[in-house]
């Protein structure tokens, strides 16, 4: 190796200056005694190198790039060799930003997978490899005092969410949770959440069903629908409130919301609808009065309201 580049820093803030030095050893005798060292950033020659012979006979060129505006580029030092450039050495330069503070950290407890799933927004692109780590600890109080640390949760590349498995959770006890972002230019931490996993529980929705008509029950009135729902069994002991939404299948009508309904109602007569009209209905529930997240909307149920009962003048015969 005839030449060697060293740089002030291989990774810098985007737009910051960078200084590089290229040294050519004396024993590269096939070279000119006074070779002119050239610099290239990517494909572009860079002027401004200051060259000197050192006391040991080596040649050194120093260049300062006033603003590194490429997020990634190769800097090389070279010599003219015949009609071509002979590259002596090259280094990869990277430029970007330290990680912004991750924001909008939120979590939900999935009782089926027995895990606490947390997600966040990573902030603007840093242009550098940036790692995110979900960090947490158990706390007996309001997270002012730290208890046992929980194993770090590292998301898969490019993902902004991570799942803490049940073995690291304590239900009905607070946890401190935050996201740490780190790259070559710095580290940042999100504000800390303090939560009991049960307070962010997200239930599965009930299953909507048509109410079986019983012989003694009156049929639904015109513009009414009778429906029932089967609660999600594993969430049955959690007090909840629910809400229905409905819209006519045809047309561009938006959803109309009905609620709150107690989960225990299990059946409901919905009135004030258009007669002889097909409706789409869905239900969702939330832990209540204790905190929780709304479930997803249930799969749709499609029902048709009955015809309006004929009024007296409809009985007249038209000849």
């Amino acid at each position: 190796e005839c030449g060697h580049i060293s740089v002030s820093a291989p990774i810098v803030h985007l737009g910051d200056p960078i200084t590089a030095s290229c040294i050519i050893k004396q024993n590269c005798s096939h070279l000119d005694p006074e070779p002119q060292i050239l610099w290239r950033l990517g494909a572009e020659l860079q002027p401004g190198g200051r060259q000197q012979r050192l006391s040991d006979g080596t040649q050194e060129s120093i260049i300062t790039l006033p603003h590194l505006n490429h997020t990634q580029a190769f800097l090389s030092c070279a010599l003219n060799w015949g009609n071509s450039l002979q590259i002596l050495d090259q280094v990869e330069l990277r430029a970007g930003y330290p990680p912004a503070i991750p924001h909008n950290l939120s979590c939900l407890m999935n009782l089926t997978t027995s895990s606490l799933i947390c997600q966040w927004e990573p902030g603007p692109e840093t242009h550098l490899p940036t790692s995110f780590t979900l960090k947490s600890f158990k706390s007996r109080g309001n997270c002012q005092t730290q208890g046992d640390s929980i194993l770090d949760c590292v998301p898969k590349d490019g993902q902004s969410h991570c799942s803490i498995p049940r073995k690291h959770l304590l239900l009905y006890q607070n946890m401190g949770i935050w996201v740490q972002a780190e790259n070559a230019l710095g580290t940042s931490m999100s504000p800390q959440l303090c939560l009991d996993p049960m307070d962010v529980v997200k239930l599965e929705p009930p299953m909507l069903r048509t109410m079986d008509p019983s012989p003694e029950a009156a049929p639904p009135q015109a513009g009414c629908l009778q429906l029932s729902w089967e609660p999600w069994q594993p969430g049955l002991h959690i007090n909840q409130k629910c809400e229905l939404r409905h819209k006519p299948q045809r047309g561009e009508a938006s959803w109309a919301l009905v609620g709150p309904l107690p989960l225990e109602a299990l059946q409901y007569e919905l009135c004030g609808l258009l007669p002889a009209t097909a409706y789409t209905l869905q239900i969702r529930c939330i832990r209540w009065p204790l905190p929780g997240h709304w479930s997803d909307w249930s799969p749709s149920l499609e029902l048709r309201t009955t015809e309006r009962a004929p009024t007296h003048h409809h009985h007249h015969h038209h000849h």
């Epitope: 009782l111 049940r166 049955l236 002991h237 225990e264």
Partner: antibody, heavy 118, light 107 residues
Framework: EVQLLESGGGLVQPGGSLRLSCAAS????????MGWVRQAPGKGLEWVSS????????PYADSVKGRFTISRDNSKNTLYLQMNSLRAEDTAVYYC???????????WGQGTLVTVSS | DIQMTQSPSSLSASVGDRVTITCRAS??????LNWYQQKPGKAPKLLIY???NLQNGVPSRFSGSGSGTDFTLTISSLQPEDFATYYC?????????FGGGTKVEIK
Amino acid sequence: EVQLLESGGGLVQPGGSLRLSCAASGFTFSLYWMGWVRQAPGKGLEWVSSISSSGGVTPYADSVKGRFTISRDNSKNTLYLQMNSLRAEDTAVYYCAKLGELGWFDPWGQGTLVTVSS
Amino acid sequence: DIQMTQSPSSLSASVGDRVTITCRASQGISSYLNWYQQKPGKAPKLLIYYASNLQNGVPSRFSGSGSGTDFTLTISSLQPEDFATYYCANSWGYPLTFGGGTKVEIK
């Protein structure tokens, strides 16, 4: 301190009836599911019935369905189990218990013995 | 109905021993598995809920693990007051079902 106190057990003839009560204190009774679990002499635990916080949902074990009725009076903080058409195999200690949100029983009452025998 | 199978039905152990009791559900129940301890003439007492959560006041030598169909209760170092019968119970859905029990006796 959460406390549950059962009463109403005793000796009854086959085909007879009995009503068990469970007085609750130390927690907001109206917010919790409650349940009955029984244990025949020398045997394991068997769930009998549960009731939702406002009484609208009342699942039963197949072995007692149609014969037993669970109910509650939230104004009196009391849980009941009305047992009709009693059989010898209903002989057991009956425990009332508070149900946790994910379906565990805690705490339990001290139990009341029901003996069905002629 | 979900059947809960506990093993062994009884075991003899000495103070200081590590004891493991297993419970198998006939179908997946996620983490809806609870463990109870019962001493003769007394009401059962909750030890572990939702498979691995230690109930308040229960010594840390008790631990629970597993999910789906296979669960374990471990007593890391058996103490004299731990000789009792242990039951697992499913709370995934009705009917709620108990295992047959494991009686832990003094060797």
